[in-house]
């Protein structure tokens, strides 16, 4: 809709920024499926939870993932110490007390159990896309975002703003 | 400091030709998606059109599809609206804008250019 | 695509007063859980200021007197106490679908 956003080229991380509120500005119960209409679901295997991309069976149910959503400080690429306006975080719960993480060392999606505050690695800037589409970059890894990679999530570097419409970082959200 | 400066304007006769130029500055230009709206002597705001950072889409008011093109140089910094087969009706101030990181809003505002379309 | 209306078209009060400002959606402005409507400012031969975004969030410097509400159709921006420098034209915009639009707009001016 809005258009595509560049990647963020700035060596200063995004986790610079700061969380406006510690409440989320308001959540949305949605289902999340990649650009070409695959699901993402959610297992509970040897009490850990599993995140796969796949073709749902018709009428099986989808998967929903609570997200949360906070508004927050761009940072300043110039002195540093500037703010470059608002962007929108999220975080996203697919059940009770667990969030998806980035893992930046195995470039990796997963989901882990924890309290609040959540750390940094559970929040993702929320890119509004074309073909209503989002996509999400990690807060702690600017130009890293959730992507699907061999039926997987995954972490992908963008490595240019002409590749941020690369299908495989592209999601849709939808309440059904 | 963001700063966004159009160039460009001026009095053109019906029928022709203008490029707008707006000069960006103070932020990371290839990051964000820009925007021309524009807004008629005494009335409201009409966006205009809007091109992503990387150049890949670009989506265009109606009135002015097939007559005004938007573009940017991300090595310049430099955001364009070339606006051909000008009609008397598109006489306005033209504001170029940047969306916030993220795309959401029109977050930066430049201070605009004047374009008069009269014989 | 989807109408803006505003209202009123004028608001006449004086610097201490409450402002409360309408802005109506044709069709809901719901998208992702976010309610895509923005108010901007405008002093007479300046640019647009965005004020509140997604209906309800202050953008970067605005003062704690501005505060927007609503969702779906309907939504209002507030001005607590009217100071000296907010007698303006105030837009409500939509970014929830090309093609982005505007209301017509609402005059503050003091009485």
């Known amino acids: 809709a809005f258009g595509i956003s560049g990647v963020q080229k700035y060596t200063r991380a995004l986790h610079d920024s700061s969380i406006t509120g510690i409440s989320p500005i308001t959540e949305y119960l949605a289902s999340l499926s990649t650009y070409n209409d695959q699901s993402i679901t959610f297992a509970l295997e040897d009490e850990s939870y599993e995140i796969y991309v796949e073709d749902l069976k018709k009428d099986e149910k989808k998967d929903k993932v609570l997200l949360s959503y906070y508004e927050s400080q761009h940072p300043s690429n110039e002195s540093g110490d500037g703010v470059d306006g608002k962007m929108l975080m999220v975080t996203l719960s697919p059940t009770k007390d667990f969030w998806l993480h980035a893992n930046n060392k195995e470039h990796s999606v997963e989901l882990h159990k924890c309290e609040k505050p959540l750390p940094d690695q559970a929040f993702f800037v929320l890119h509004n896309m074309h073909s209503n589409c989002v996509s999400f970059e990690c807060k702690t890894d600017p130009g890293v975002f959730i992507g699907v990679k061999d039926n997987h999530l995954a972490l992908i570097k963008v490595d240019s703003s002409e590749n941020l419409c690369t299908e495989n970082i592209l999601f849709k959200l939808s309440e059904t | 400091e963001v700063q966004l400066v159009e160039s460009g304007g001026g009095l053109v006769q019906p029928g022709g030709s203008l490029r707008l130029s707006c000069a960006a500055s103070?932020?990371?230009?290839?990051?964000?998606?820009m925007s021309w709206v524009r807004q008629a002597p005494g009335k409201g705001l009409e966006w205009v059109a809007t091109?992503?950072?990387?150049?890949?889409?670009?989506d265009y008011v109606d009135s002015v599809k097939g007559r005004f093109t938007i573009s940017r140089d991300n090595s310049k910094n430099t955001l364009y609206l070339q606006m051909n087969s000008l009609r008397a009706e598109d006489t306005a101030v033209y504001y170029c804008t940047r969306a916030n990181y993220g795309n959401w809003f029109f977050e930066v505002w430049g201070q605009g250019t004047l374009v008069t379309v009269s014989s | 695509e989807i109408v803006l209306t505003q209202s009123p078209a004028t608001l006449s009060l004086s610097p201490g007063e409450r402002a409360t400002l309408s802005c109506r959606a044709s069709?809901?402005?719901?998208?992702?859980?976010?309610?895509?409507l923005n108010w901007f400012q405008q002093k007479p031969g300046q640019p647009p200021r965005l004020l509140i975004f997604a209906a309800s969030n202050r953008g970067s410097g605005i003062p704690a007197r501005f505060s927007g509400s609503g969702s779906g159709t309907d939504f209002t921006l507030t001005i607590s106490s009217l100071e000296p420098e907010d007698f303006a034209v105030y837009f409500c915009q939509q970014s929830k679908e090309v093609p982005f639009t505007f209301g017509q707009g609402t005059k503050v001016e003091i009485k």
């Open positions: 091109i992503s950072g990387g150049k890949t889409f670009t």
């Open positions: 069709e809901s402005v719901a998208k992702y859980g976010l309610s895509l």
């Open positions: 103070g932020f990371t230009f290839s990051s964000f998606s």
